[in-house]
């Protein structure tokens, strides 16, 4: 019973974690404009792994994709790769773990096979979680480095006169989502590995004995009756994220001049 609970909980935790990794990867707010100790601007800049966005005080938001591969920093490419590897491993892990669940009976799958699948999915979840944590941490490190570099260069200009105030970026919501999601996936993986130990059949000194009754041939094996249950999931994944640090309360996307009515 404890094994089933541990395995089930590990699966659910990993599922939430992987959903979080996917959400973090898709989010636009990996880095957001630093508003502290900065000249207050009427625009708010934020960037993701795939595009950068600008929100004006009018609420009008414009996002531009990074339509180049070669022109992007190697670190950003590495982060993208880590997150995608994390998602792929996590997705495969989920697929494997569904079949490994003790509460689901698929054909005449042996417990040893389920144990192996549970261990495999557990390892996949652990690696997936580590990939996500590594990806987010690399990006965070990149941000910290750039933050201090831009702080040092912030008030430099031609002839000592301030020409441009550099936009500094700080941690966005996606980083925190990624760290938490990676952690959950890792924990889920560890739980699956723990459950695997309980699933592995112990060696017994006797073999299955067949008792022949007249006219019938019924085989009895040691071990209790395993109930077969259908395990359905109706989880809706909605990507919901806010505009980050706003200087205004709630602003919606701006309509065209003629939409004012």
């Amino acid at each position: 019973m404890a094994v089933t609970a541990c395995q089930g909980l590990g699966f659910v935790v990993s599922l939430i974690g992987i959903a979080g990794i996917i959400a973090a990867t898709c989010m636009d707010q990996w880095s957001t404009q630093d508003l502290y100790n900065n000249p207050v601007t009427a625009v708010f800049n934020y960037q993701g792994l795939w595009r950068s966005c600008v929100r004006e005080s009018s609420g009008f938001t414009e996002c531009r994709g990074y339509f180049t591969l070669l022109g992007l920093p190697a670190m950003l490419q590495a982060v993208r790769a880590l997150m995608i590897v994390g998602i792929v491993l996590g997705a495969i892990g989920l697929l494997v773990s569904i079949f490994a669940l003790k509460c689901i009976r698929i054909g005449s799958m042996e417990d040893s096979a389920k144990a192996n699948m549970t261990l495999t999915s557990g390892i996949m979840f652990i690696v997936s979680g580590l990939c996500a944590i590594a990806g987010v941490s690399v990006f965070a490190n990149m941000l910290v480095t750039n933050f201090w570099m831009s702080t040092a260069n912030m008030y430099t200009g031609m002839g000592g006169m301030v020409q441009t105030v550099q936009t500094r970026y700080t941690f966005g919501a996606a980083l925190f989502v990624g760290w938490v999601a990676g952690g959950l996936t890792l924990i889920g993986g560890v739980m699956m590995c723990i459950a695997c130990r309980g699933l592995a059949p112990e060696e017994t000194n006797y073999k299955a004995v067949s008792y022949h009754a007249s006219g019938h041939s019924v085989a009895y094996k040691p071990g209790g009756f395993k109930a077969s249950t259908g395990f359905g999931s109706n989880t809706k994944n909605k990507k919901i994220y806010d505009g980050g640090a706003r200087t205004e309360d709630e602003v919606q996307s701006y309509p065209s001049k003629h939409d004012y009515v």
Epitope: S58, D249, E250
Partner: antibody, heavy 118, light 113 residues
């Protein structure tokens, strides 16, 4: 279409206060920041500040922080600007304008002429 | 605060003439995030509120005649009227829409020769 109604003129005594109104229609009042701009006779334009009608959060030009107070009444889609301790320097036309693309002002009220005179 | 310097302060023109006026800001109005310059041009006639002509330094507002063109980037901006009409006689203001507090130039007055 977008309309911003402002009273034509206000005559006030030095040292007194005046509350100017700006009634908005033709757009979702609570969705867009509303700005106030001052223009002295024959002079240029000066940005006073802005208010977000939804939450009431404000951002003032340092120069007008002690002079102007911005408020809104969501139920009537009206923005207000109270000017205190009036002097002859405050005699001007005051405009209200909601923010537009590029943080610009596409729509303006007709302006309220405030005359400070004994 | 950002200082907006407009020149010349006044221009005497004749109908059909090409006119150029300048606006300089004390700091760059270019936002690196979208490569847009947050500078706006307004036209104001006596007794009227300002009218939006150009935003994002070069985007013409709908309904504004195409003889009005905005250009420039960073700190230097220009408003060009390709062929001045009688109804264009007014004061033209540039505005910093990037940094708070928003600031306006002192204006360029277009007068009839």
């Amino acid at each position: 279409q977008v309309q911003l109604q402002q009273p034509g003129a206000e005559l006030v005594k030095p040292g007194a206060s005046v509350k100017l109104s700006c009634k908005a229609s033709g757009y979702t009042f609570t969705s867009y920041l509303l700005h106030w701009v001052k223009q002295r006779p024959g002079q240029g334009l000066e940005w006073i500040g802005m208010i977000h009608p939804n939450g009431g959060s404000t951002n003032y030009n340092e120069k007008f922080k002690t002079k102007a107070t911005l408020t809104v009444d969501k139920s009537s889609s009206t923005a207000y600007m109270q000017l205190s301790s009036l002097t002859s320097e405050d005699s001007a036309v005051y405009y209200c304008a909601p923010v537009y693309f590029g943080n610009s002002f596409a729509y303006w009220g007709q302006g309220t002429l405030v005359t400070v005179s004994a | 605060d950002i200082v907006m310097t407009q020149s010349p302060s006044s221009l005497t023109v004749t109908a059909g003439e090409k006119v150029t006026m300048s606006c300089k800001s004390s700091q760059s109005l270019l936002n690196s995030g979208n490569q847009k310059n947050y500078l706006t041009w307004y036209q104001q006639k006596p007794g009227q509120p300002p009218k939006l002509l150009i935003y994002w330094a070069s985007t013409r507002e709908s309904g504004v005649p195409d003889r009005f063109t905005g250009s420039g980037s960073g700190t230097d901006f220009t408003l060009t009227i390709s062929s001045v009409q009688a109804e264009d006689l007014a004061v033209y203001y540039c505005q910093n829409d990037y940094y708070y507090p928003f600031t306006f130039g002192s204006g360029t007055k277009l007068e009839k020769k």
